[in-house]
């Protein structure tokens, strides 16, 4: 036995556009309440009942009056937890439903008036004893954020609540093969107490003054094997007293789950996981319809018109889940090819594409060069998804169009004197500096580090680079 | 702009099989639901199926048996096939772009006559 | 299945006028997924409104859905020669998608 507790933290508008308008105004202040419903197993469905692990309502929140002309914020909520007691073991797995409801305190004839503002559903994994889970979900254009546990009630414990403790009986120890009952170290665990006689290797109880029997067992205390004839594929364990087991009919053959489950042999018998819709100990039992609009985010409920038949949500682009709850991030796919920025914009996929790639999903590799003329005789160079412009002497800019400055990057060394000219540069050099850079010193005998001027050409005359 | 295009014989005999295509351009047929929709004429309309660029398809209930809706994604395009026509098929058929937001239909063709007649 | 009935078959009014087309549904339609149509003779339906009460995109603000529950209602505030058409709902709640019978909107 043990409590599921559920804290909620925030309820109001979610991130992104389209934020809901208030539910409350001026002319109708409102107050809101939530309801939760729990079930065992992650089962598919989203039925409002039954809640067999259990269900809560909370406290009605402190009224709440829209400012005019200010967006919805946060609304105010109830105090306190909402607890959902539960009397078995704690199952581990378990279904939530979390509603949130409206309580219009109007001057309506009759009372108040109730309507379901939003409701989120989803299947969790929890045991437990073990600390608060946080959790966000969102319905439509509201976000419900909350935290949530289980806890076993005394003297339970263990991720199932299934392990009973009592106080010690000796100060410094617990019994022969029971163990301390952490964190309750002064507590040790209690010894369920089966029904006397019950075979201790083949059966087992859950309750006082039960004998369950392990597979291949059967009798009143488990005791007797399901058959000792040939020794053909055993079914289990085997001893010298009973000899082999062999496959009597397994607690699965022939399928017990009705509707569409799966059956899984357990321990004890046999288990069915429901397809969404269904539920109870053979799938029996149809919860959810399609009039209960278990559908979520535009989603269409096809099938499960009477309750005899299951239910499918039908997700519109973007979401899934069996309730079409979740938002799938189409993105993480990387659906956009050669580097292309994937935008998720709700109603479309859009992939924004490097330079030199085209296409839906930036599949096209464009050809930089096509219909791209480099100006004034210059040569066009592919290159990494973008063109390059090679370009003629005396040109530059990304096409070629420009009239390079030669003198810009100061190319005369030692102080000598740049001159653009048509066919390149010209540099006039510093007294004792020669060559076409003015990069050589000349020697104060007349003599230079370079072989002989050209005919023609005195050292200190301006040397033309070509 | 997503523009919808049906195309397909306008005259089919009693027991065959209608067939139309619908050619989706201005737009990938991929990430959206397809659906037929017909209008017999001076009447309503009539759903009458969609599919889902997966392959996932569903289909008015009392015409099931009849109908398959089929997807060519590599050319942009979906098609229908009727069985077993009689004159009460006699309609408008347009094909229709479901909505991101829901079931509902945010472009349509322009519409395809279909006679059935002998 | 979902069905919905239009109502009036036939509605004649003058342009400038307050039209109000009624769409009730046999079953409740949850979260009001409920859409509008406009069709002209001779051309395919045309979205106006979706979600009972959103209007589809270059929808003149003329027009307006609302409605929960069993009872939907388009209203065009002040009617347009162009807006004499036929009107159909049509519920995407629950498979199968289901139209009206539709609303003939004429010239008085």
């Known amino acids: 036995a043990g409590v599921f507790e559920l804290q909620i933290h925030s309820f109001g508008p979610g991130p992104g556009p389209g934020a809901p308008r208030s539910p409350c105004s001026a002319r109708l202040p409102c107050r809101l309440f939530f309801r939760v419903c729990l079930k065992p197993g992650l089962s598919e469905e989203a039925a409002e009942s039954p809640c067999a692990l259990g269900a809560a309502l909370s406290a009605r929140g402190p009224v709440y009056t829209e400012q005019p002309g200010a967006p919805a914020p946060d609304l105010p909520l109830p105090d306190g937890l909402l607890q959902v007691p539960f009397r078995d073991a704690w199952p581990g797995t378990f279904s939530f439903i979390i509603e949130t409801w409206r309580e219009e305190l109007g001057d309506q004839i009759g009372g108040p008036a109730w309507s379901l503002l939003a409701r989120v559903a989803g299947r969790r994994r929890l045991a437990a004893g073990g600390p608060w889970a946080r959790d966000i979900q969102r319905a439509g254009a509201w976000e419900l954020r909350f935290s949530y546990r289980a806890r076993c009630e005394p003297p339970a414990v263990g991720t199932a609540c299934t392990r009973l403790c009592r106080p010690r009986s000796a100060p410094s120890r617990c019994g022969p093969g029971l163990r301390p009952c952490a964190p309750l170290e002064d507590e040790c665990e209690a010894p369920l107490v089966c029904r006397a006689g019950c075979s201790p290797e083949h059966g087992f109880c859950e309750q006082p003054g039960e004998c369950r029997c392990l597979e291949g067992w059967t009798g009143p205390l488990c005791t007797v094997p399901v058959s000792t004839s040939s020794c053909l594929s055993p079914r289990g364990p085997s001893s010298a007293t009973t000899g082999c087991l062999v496959p009597g009919p397994g607690p699965c053959d022939g399928n017990p789950c009705a509707n569409g489950g799966s059956c899984s042999e357990t321990p004890r018998s046999f288990e069915c996981t429901c397809p969404r819709g269904f539920y109870g100990l053979r799938c029996e039992v149809s919860g959810v319809t399609c009039a209960d609009g278990p559908c979520f985010n535009g989603g269409l409920c096809v099938g499960g018109a009477d309750p005899d038949s299951a239910y499918i949500c039908h997700c519109p682009p973007g979401f899934q889940g069996s309730n079409c709850e979740k938002r799938v991030d189409r993105c993480s796919l990387q659906p956009c090819r050669n580097g292309g920025l994937c935008l998720d914009l709700g109603h479309a996929l859009r992939c924004r594409c490097r330079a030199g790639f085209a296409g839906p999903r930036c599949e096209h590799d464009l050809d930089d060069c096509a219909g791209r003329a480099c100006a004034n005789g210059g040569t066009c160079v592919e290159g990494g998804g973008a063109h390059r412009c090679s370009c003629a002497l005396g040109f530059g800019g990304r096409d070629c169009r420009e009239r390079a400055d030669p003198c810009a990057a100061r190319p005369c060394a030692h102080g000598g004197r740049c001159y653009a000219h048509f066919s390149g540069l010209v540099c006039a050099c510093a007294p004792g500096y020669m060559g076409a850079r003015c990069e050589f010193p000349v020697h104060p005998d007349g003599a230079s580090a370079l072989p002989a001027a050209p005919p023609g050409l005195r050292p200190g005359d301006p040397q033309r680079y070509l | 702009q997503v523009q919808l295009q049906e195309s397909g014989p306008g005259l089919v005999k009693p027991s065959e099989t209608l067939s139309l295509t619908c050619t989706v351009s201005?737009?990938?047929?991929?990430?959206?639901?397809w659906s037929w929709i017909r209008q017999p004429p001076g009447k309503g309309l009539e759903w009458i199926g969609y599919?889902?660029?997966?392959?996932?398809?569903n289909y008015y209930p009392s015409l099931k048996s009849r109908v398959t809706i089929s997807i060519d994604t590599s050319k942009n395009q979906f098609s229908l096939k009727l069985s077993s026509v009689t004159a009460a098929d006699t309609a408008v058929y347009y094909c229709?772009?479901?909505?991101?937001?829901?079931?509902?239909?945010?472009?349509w063709g322009q519409g395809t006559l279909v006679t059935v007649s002998s | 299945e979902i069905v919905l009935t239009q109502s009036p078959g036939t509605l004649s009014l003058s342009p400038g006028e307050r039209a109000t087309l009624s769409c009730r549904a046999s079953?409740?339609?949850?979260?009001?997924?409920l859409a509008w149509y406009q069709q002209k003779p001779g051309q395919a339906p045309r979205l106006l409104i979706y979600?009972?009460?959103s209007r589809a995109t270059g929808i003149p603000d003329r027009f307006s859905g609302s409605g929960s529950g069993t009872d939907f209602t388009l209203t065009i505030s002040r009617l347009e020669p162009e807006d004499f058409a036929v009107y159909y709902c049509?519920?995407?709640?629950?498979?199968?998608?289901?139209f009206g019978g539709g609303t003939k909107l004429e010239i008085k």
């Open positions: 229709a772009r479901i909505a991101v937001a829901g079931f509902f239909f945010d472009y």
């Open positions: 201005g737009g990938s047929i991929s990430s959206y639901y």
């Open positions: 599919i889902y660029y997966s392959g996932r398809t």
């Open positions: 079953q409740s339609v949850n979260k009001n997924y």
């Open positions: 979600g009972a009460s």
């Open positions: 049509q519920q995407y709640d629950r498979s199968p998608l289901t």
